[in-house]
């Protein structure tokens, strides 16, 4: 019982849920629910039954595997997704899988909180601007990585001569795509012009 | 919360029928079975029939063949179960419960709080 | 019809005892069995299906074991809100029949 499999996609993909293992023989009805109680198809050795969700029209059972399709994945669609298989001998037996849908990244902009020259030195402060999503950040001063310390949505720094950078990037990804915003200074410590 | 409410208490005379209803909650009411079982004052559990949701398919138990009646209305998610030709032997308390699956499973996972039916002259 | 036999009729215990209820099918019936449990003048609620499941929300101290035609629904360690009246039920064929209950009373 209880077997959880976790899964990221993207949203308006097309997913198909199943499980690593084959189904038990001569099973008798095969369910998915999403969430408790909320059933989306159930096979019955005669024919696929979908009944009225908001997946209607959108999923397919494969009876063979089990594996359920279902196209255009939206954020809506997060929930706990779970196959119960009754046995020829009454025995139940279930697997879940826990979906979660993401939309892509927005390409995040660049936006220059502070730059000032101190002696030879510039200190500089950028902050890497998404509307409210739940990301990693990750700077890069001319494609090589700050340390992981500063990988946050403020790039906060004072660069020496040695290690000045002229372009710097922030990457923003979660699990299913990334995007980078750059910006460029010319040195030693003003903004270059676009 | 899952949930099934039947309708109240009826007093009938012998020879009239009845008509309990129980209503559904709480789960996608065309995917699961109701069952109607029925238990007169002192006795045991018996089984009475069993309707689809999904397709009104139904089983009844053989001694009420002929005599039960047991449907569905989607729109409401509301099972009705019809007794016709009463006797004082059909005094009984009776209850629904639902099927674990749209094909009857056997497997009845939730119940109504029941329905007193008396019969008398 | 399948017959279900139950045994005892009656059982008397205390709080804190393990209870052990029989049901034996009149014919093979694999794990297609439920337990049900009755309080007076309440509906019946399910406790255990497929033999062995035990239905969500129903406390650990329930267990169910068996096949075919024994089976066996144990209380571990009775608490004050298990005294009721306790069915079997075959799933494997219609018409579904029921044990005639087994009574658990205060000792």
């Known amino acids: 019982q209880g077997h959880l499999v976790h899964m990221t996609v993207v949203s308006g993909s097309n997913v198909t849920l199943n499980i690593s293992e084959s189904l038990p023989e001569n099973y008798k009805q095969l369910t998915w629910f999403y969430t408790f109680d909320q059933k989306i198809v159930e096979w019955d050795s005669r024919k696929s039954k979908y009944f009225e969700s908001k997946f209607k029209g959108r999923v397919r059972l494969d009876p063979q595997s089990g594996a359920l399709y279902i196209s255009k994945v939206q954020k809506e669609d997060n929930s706990t997704y779970i196959m119960r298989v009754l046995k020829k001998t009454g025995n139940e037996q279930e697997w879940k899988i826990k979906l979660q849908v993401l939309d892509p990244v927005p390409k995040p902009v660049i936006k220059i909180e502070k730059i000032e020259d101190m002696d030879d030195n510039c200190y500089l402060k950028l902050s890497c601007v998404i509307p409210g999503e739940s990301v990693n950040y990750t700077w890069y001063g001319d494609k090589r990585p700050f340390p992981k310390e500063l990988q946050n949505s403020v790039l906060e720094t004072t660069l020496m001569p040695h290690n000045y950078s002229r372009c710097y990037t922030c990457q923003v990804s979660n699990s299913v795509s990334s995007k980078n915003g750059t910006v460029c200074l010319s040195p030693p410590c003003t903004l270059a012009r676009s | 919360q899952v949930q099934l409410v039947q309708s109240g208490a009826e007093v009938k005379k012998p020879g009239a029928s009845v008509k309990v209803s129980c209503k559904t909650s709480g789960y996608t009411f065309a995917g699961y079975g109701i069952t109607w079982v029925r238990q007169a004052p002192g006795r045991g559990l018996e089984w009475m029939g069993w309707?689809?949701?999904?397709?009104?398919?139904?089983d009844y138990a053989q001694s009420l063949q002929g005599r039960v009646t047991m449907t569905t209305d989607t729109s409401t998610s509301t099972a009705y179960m019809e007794l016709r030709s009463l006797r004082s032997d059909d005094t009984a308390m009776y209850y629904c419960?639902?099927?674990?699956?749209?094909?009857?499973?056997?497997?009845?996972?939730?119940w109504g709080q029941g329905t007193l039916v008396t019969v008398s002259s | 019809d399948i017959q279900m036999t139950q045994s005892p009729s009656s059982v008397s215990a205390s709080v804190g005892d393990r209870v052990t209820i029989t049901c034996r099918a009149s014919?093979?019936?694999?794990?297609?069995l439920a337990w049900h449990q009755q309080k007076p003048g309440k509906a019946p609620k399910v406790l255990i299906y497929a033999a062995s499941s035990l239905h969500s929300g129903v406390p650990s101290r329930f267990s169910g074991s068996g096949s075919g035609t024994e089976f066996t629904l144990t209380i571990s360690s009775l608490q004050p809100e298990d005294f009721a009246t306790y069915y079997c039920?075959?799933?494997?064929?219609?018409?579904?029949?029921f044990g005639q209950g087994t009574k658990l009373e205060i000792k």
């Open positions: 039920q075959q799933a494997n064929t219609f018409p579904y029949t």
């Open positions: 309707v689809s949701a999904y397709n009104g398919d139904t």
């Open positions: 014919q093979g019936i694999s794990s297609w």
């Open positions: 419960a639902r099927d674990r699956y749209s094909s009857s499973s056997g497997y009845f996972d939730y």
